[in-house]
């Protein structure tokens, strides 16, 4: 999906009002020195691409993020503020349902959510001149 035509300000508002707090809750009890952010993004569409990938694509050691509250709210925000996003996700959602597993918060998941927080920070305030 090409995130170029999303309403970035509305997504930012959704993130700051609820999603950010859910991420903090998920990370509660984790030391602020524990993880080093290695995933970066250069502009808002790129940031959303990386955020979608880390939030919804199962990875080795962390298969369950898509069912977390912050993930569901992220999905809702993208569906509302990115034209045509919902349609692209129907097949992916059906595939997800087939491999649903019980929620387990692993260290790998905590690391992944730390990466997400970093990506959202760059989405909220890109370093590039054109924001």
């Amino acid at each position: 999906y090409d995130f170029t035509n999303c309403d970035f300000e509305k997504i930012k508002a959704a993130y700051l009002s609820t999603i950010s707090k859910d991420l903090i809750t998920y990370m509660s009890g984790t030391k602020s020195t524990e993880f080093n952010n290695t995933v970066s993004c250069s502009n808002r569409p790129h940031c959303l691409t990386e955020i979608q990938s880390l939030t919804f694509n199962p990875t080795a050691g962390c298969a369950s993020l898509a069912k977390e509250m912050f993930a569901m709210k992220t999905k809702a925000a993208l569906a509302i503020w990115c034209p045509g996003y919902s349609e692209t996700q129907i097949n992916a959602t059906q595939a997800m349902k087939k491999r649903r597993k019980r929620k387990v918060t692993t260290n790998k998941c905590l690391e992944q959510v730390s990466q997400l927080q970093g990506l959202w920070r760059r989405f909220n305030r890109p370093l590039l001149k054109q924001q």
Partner: antibody, heavy 119, light 107 residues
């Protein structure tokens, strides 16, 4: 506990350069932007620029472009600002600050470094 | 550059009374406004981010509102510890810019 500790006061001659350091602790240095802000005596706050310690990306206020250089050393968790071609108007307290967890504000500030430019 | 204009530049308030500071942007900054307080002899400290969100530990007597070009910081009941200079800041466009500051004194 997050802390930003800056280097001590400096007195410089016009035309010279100054380098101020900002040592971060209590968090992963490369994960958060470091901002630089200055405050002339009795005046308000002026944003100088920002650096991403993770990759060295910077953005400068045009008013300081060519004179200010922001750098960061991940091995020591220290950010630096170097200001060249100093003039008396550069006399100010220089602050470093860290972006907050959402990327929309500066949540931790250094104690400030007074730079005096005088002949 | 986006100019942030604060009014008033100073105000003197009786403890327990309300106070209000206005910040106007020269062009729309959406909701990308932050408020800081600089107490005498100290570094600035974060109060409110993204117009109305309280930073950790900031008393709820502080509140922020507005969008676009007009923003307001309100203190419902001023206390002695609230003295200092209040700054609004926009981070919608580079360069980031601050208002000129509003000095709050206690009567």
């Amino acid at each position: 506990e997050v802390q930003l500790v800056q280097s001590g006061a400096e007195v410089k001659k016009p035309g010279s350069s100054v380098k101020v350091s900002c040592k971060a602790s209590g968090y992963t240095f490369s994960n958060y932007l470091i901002e630089w802000v200055r405050q002339a005596p009795g005046q308000g706050l002026e944003w100088i620029g920002v650096i991403d310690p993770g990759n060295g990306d910077t953005n400068y206020n045009e008013n300081f472009k060519g004179r200010a250089t922001l750098t960061a050393d991940k091995s020591t968790s220290t950010a630096y600002i170097e200001l060249s071609s100093l003039r008396s108007e550069d006399t100010a307290v220089y602050y470093c600050a860290r972006e907050d967890n959402t990327g929309t504000a500066f949540d931790y500030w250094g104690q400030g470094t007074t730079v005096t430019v005088s002949s | 550059d986006i100019v942030m204009t604060q009014t008033p530049l100073s105000l003197s308030v009786t403890p327990g009374q309300p106070a209000s500071i206005s910040c106007k942007a020269s062009q729309s900054v959406s909701s990308d406004v932050t408020w800081y307080l600089q107490k005498p002899g100290q570094s600035p400290q974060l109060l409110i981010y993204y117009v109305s969100n309280h930073y950790t530990g900031v008393p709820d007597r502080f509140s922020g509102s507005g969008s676009g070009t007009d923003f307001t910081l309100k203190i419902s009941r001023v206390e002695a510890e609230d003295v200092g200079v209040y700054y609004c800041q926009q981070h919608h466009r580079f360069p980031l810019t601050f208002g000129q500051g509003t000095k709050l004194e206690i009567k």
